[in-house]
């Protein structure tokens, strides 16, 4: 599990690559509040 925006699916990365898009470090994080601590 990852909630700090470091995670992006390979599928999304692949789609962006094939479409000529640029993968940036601003992926939307999963919802922090739905995780306990």
């Amino acid at each position: 599990a990852c909630d700090t925006a470091t995670c992006v699916t390979h599928r999304l990365a692949g789609l962006l690559s094939r479409s000529g898009g640029v993968v940036k470090n601003n992926f939307v994080p999963t919802n922090v509040g739905s995780k306990a601590f």
Partner: antibody, heavy 115, light 108 residues
Framework: EVQLQQSGPELVKPGASVKMSCKAS????????MHWVKQKPGQGLEWIGY????????KYNEKFKGKATLTSDKSSSTAYMELSSLTSEDSAVYYC????????WGQGTTLTVSS | EIVLTQSPTTMAASPGEKITITCSAS???????LHWYQQKPGFSPKVLIY???NLASGVPARFSGSGSGTSYSLTIGTMEAEDVATYYC?????????FGSGTKLEIK
């Protein structure tokens, strides 16, 4: 094994500042946000805020804005909390806690503010 | 901010007894944002239940959680001596995240 090792107890004078640390090990530091929680002696838990170590993004409880500053150091997998303009009301145990449903908390840092 | 009101504040139970602690929220929240913690005297808190009903790793099956909207509960099926602790609910629906004021569980 995941561990959160917090710095030792602090005795500081009113008006001073203090910076406490929370060293993480056993997991990828940048993959979980780190929460900070305050507990006064004999009282309940109060959420201060969290830091995202990946990009140093923070979210604060409005009550602690201007009092607490959260930072992190990816190279040492350490989260920090600095508390400023200390008063007796800041005397408490402060915990860091890793987000993720797996229940990892530091052992707590006891802060005593006294002249 | 969302205020979480726990009931009772303190209670004493006999070993084997069934215990229910309630947590009432001042605004409706989705169950995925409601968590329960246990804090034994002198120790850090630990998560018991996450997302209202999911048992955290290593937590005995006698603990369970339920609820929705503004009303949530934590149940201990059969009280044991090691369950003496303070229990807190916590919401992550809106910032600031907030905790209930705690329920102190003692043994008779």
């Amino acid at each position: 094994e995941v561990q959160l090792q917090q710095s030792g107890p602090e005795l500081v004078k009113p008006g001073a500042s203090v910076k406490m640390s929370c060293k993480a090990s056993g997991y990828t530091f940048t993959r979980s946000v780190m929460h900070w929680v305050k507990q006064k002696p004999g009282q309940g838990l109060e959420w201060i805020g969290y830091i995202n170590p990946y990009n140093d993004g923070t979210k604060y409880n409005e009550k602690f804005k201007g009092k607490a500053t959260l930072t992190s150091d990816k190279s040492s997998s350490t989260a920090y909390m600095e508390l400023s303009s200390l008063t007796s009301e800041d005397s408490a145990v402060y915990y860091c806690a890793k987000s993720g449903n797996d229940g990892y908390w530091g052992q707590g840092t006891t802060l005593t503010v006294s002249s | 901010e969302i205020v979480l009101t726990q009931s009772p504040t303190t209670m004493a139970a006999s070993p084997g007894e069934k215990i229910t602690i309630t947590c009432s929220a001042s605004s409706s929240i989705s169950s995925i944002y409601l968590h329960w913690y246990q804090q034994k005297p002198g120790f850090s808190p630990k998560v018991l239940i996450y997302r209202a009903k999911n048992l955290a790793s290593g937590v005995p099956a006698r603990f369970s959680g339920s609820g929705s909207g503004t009303s949530y509960s934590l149940t201990i099926g059969t009280m044991e001596a090691e369950d003496v602790a303070t229990y807190y609910c916590q919401q992550g629906s809106t910032i600031p995240f907030t905790f209930g004021s705690g329920t102190k569980l003692e043994i008779k």
